[in-house]
C-alpha cells in the first residue's frame, strides 16, 4: 500500500543554472488531487524549494515567484528548477502526496543529486 517515488540519482545543471528531472510515482489509489513538493536536503537539514498542487489531467502550476516549473502526465511529473548556482549543489527530494480522495498517501523519493557549476566569466576582449 505504500507509495513508491522514483527519481534520477544524479543530474547536472546546465551552464545557465537550469536542472530538469522526472519524478514518477506508483499510485496505490486513484487520486484526483496531487501535491508535489521539491525539498533540498543539506547536512540533515531539509528545506522546501517549491510546491504545487494539481488536479489529475490538469497542468502543474507553481507560484509566480517560484524557481520551479513543471508538467504532469499521468503519474509522472517533469520538474525544472532554474536560477541555480554552484552553492545550490545538493540533494533534491521529490515528495508526492495524494490529497484527494481519501485515503491520503505520502511518497518520498531517494533524492536527485544536482550538481551546479558556475560558468567561467568571459575574458575581456580588446
Amino acid at each position: 500500500k505504500a507509495m513508491h517515488v522514483a527519481q534520477p540519482a544524479v543530474v547536472l545543471a546546465s551552464s545557465r543554472g537550469i536542472a530538469s528531472f522526472v519524478c514518477e510515482y506508483a499510485s496505490p489509489g486513484k487520486a484526483t488531487e496531487v501535491r508535489v513538493t521539491v525539498l533540498r536536503q543539506a547536512d540533515s537539514q531539509v528545506t522546501e524549494v517549491c510546491a504545487a498542487t494539481y488536479m489529475m489531467g490538469n497542468e502543474l502550476t507553481f507560484l509566480d515567484d517560484s524557481i520551479c516549473t513543471g508538467t504532469s502526465s499521468g503519474n509522472q511529473v517533469n520538474l525544472t528548477i532554474q536560477g541555480l548556482r554552484a552553492m545550490d549543489t545538493g540533494l533534491y527530494i521529490c515528495k508526492v502526496e495524494l490529497m484527494y480522495p481519501p485515503p491520503y498517501y505520502l511518497g518520498i523519493g531517494n533524492g536527485t543529486q544536482i550538481y551546479v557549476i558556475d560558468p567561467e566569466p568571459c575574458p575581456d576582449s580588446d
Partner: antibody, heavy 118, light 108 residues
C-alpha cells in the same frame, strides 16, 4: 524559536462542545500539515485529525468523524479543533503536532487537557 | 488501517544496558514512513527517529533505528538515566496515521 502552544481545554459535560486552539510560531505555518493527537489518562497516543497546507484537505480518525472539525487560519498561524457531541471517551490530553517536511511529527505542543464528565 | 504492535509492553533494564524495542506492522510499511518517539511522564512526545533509521535533530547516537517491511527495531545502545520513558512507533505513509501501543522502559 519553533513552537506550538495549545489552549481551550477544560471540563465539559457529555454532549456539549469545546474548541481547542494551537498557536504556531517560528516557522512558515502554511507550508506544513498540522495534526491533533490525543492521549487518554494512562493510555497511548491516538491520532485524531490533520489539516494540510491551505486547509482544503482534512482527514479524521473514525472515532471522531462527524463530531470533530479541524480548521486553520494561516493568517493567524493558528490551528483549531471544534469538538461537538463530546463523550466520556474523549477525555484526554490533546496535543497539536507539526508534520515535518519528510512526514514525521517533529514539533509538539505541551498539550491541553479535556475532561468530559457529568 | 495499519496496526502497529509493539513488544515487549515493559522492558526492565539497568543503566548501561542495551535496550531493543520491537514494532511490527499488520501490513508492509515503507521504511521511509516509520518513526519512533520518546515520551516522559507529563511531557509531550519527542521525535527520535524518522524514516526508520534517521536520527532527528539533537538525538544522541546511542539511539538507532532499523528494519523494513513489517518489522522495525529501536535500539538504545547504552541506557542513560534519562532514557527511562515510554517509546512509541508510528507510521505516517498513509491515513489514518497510527501509533503502536507503546513500550515502557523502566529501571530494574
Amino acid at each position: 524559536q519553533v513552537q506550538l502552544v495549545e489552549s481551550g481545554g477544560g471540563v465539559v459535560q457529555p454532549g456539549r462542545s469545546l474548541r481547542l486552539s494551537c498557536a504556531a510560531s517560528g516557522f512558515t505555518f502554511s507550508s506544513y500539515g498540522v495534526h491533533w493527537v490525543r492521549q487518554a489518562p494512562g493510555k497511548g497516543l491516538e491520532w485524531v485529525s490533520v489539516i494540510l497546507y491551505d486547509g482544503n484537505n482534512k482527514f479524521y480518525a473514525d472515532s471522531v468523524k462527524g463530531r470533530f472539525t479541524i480548521s486553520r487560519d494561516n493568517s493567524k498561524n493558528t490551528l483549531y479543533l471544534q469538538m461537538n457531541s463530546l463523550r466520556a471517551e474523549d477525555t484526554a490530553v490533546y496535543f497539536c503536532a507539526r508534520g515535518a517536511l519528510l512526514g514525521a511529527f517533529d514539533i509538539w505542543g505541551r498539550g491541553t487537557m479535556v475532561t468530559v464528565s457529568s | 488501517e495499519i496496526v502497529l504492535t509493539q513488544s515487549p509492553g515493559t522492558l526492565s533494564l539497568s543503566p548501561g544496558e542495551r535496550a531493543t524495542l520491537s514494532c511490527r506492522a499488520s501490513q508492509s510499511v515503507s521504511s521511509s514512513y516509520l518513526a519512533w518517539y520518546q515520551q516522559k511522564p507529563g511531557q509531550a512526545p519527542r521525535l527520535l527517529i524518522y524514516g526508520a533509521s534517521s536520527r532527528a535533530t539533537g538525538i544522541p547516537d546511542r539511539f538507532s533505528g532499523s528494519g523494513s517491511g513489517t518489522d522495525f527495531t529501536l535500539t538504545i545502545s547504552r541506557l542513560e538515566p534519562e532514557d527511562f520513558a515510554v517509546y512509541y512507533c508510528q507510521q505516517y505513509g498513509s491515513s489514518p496515521w497510527t501509533f503502536g501501543q507503546g513500550t515502557k522502559v523502566e529501571i530494574k
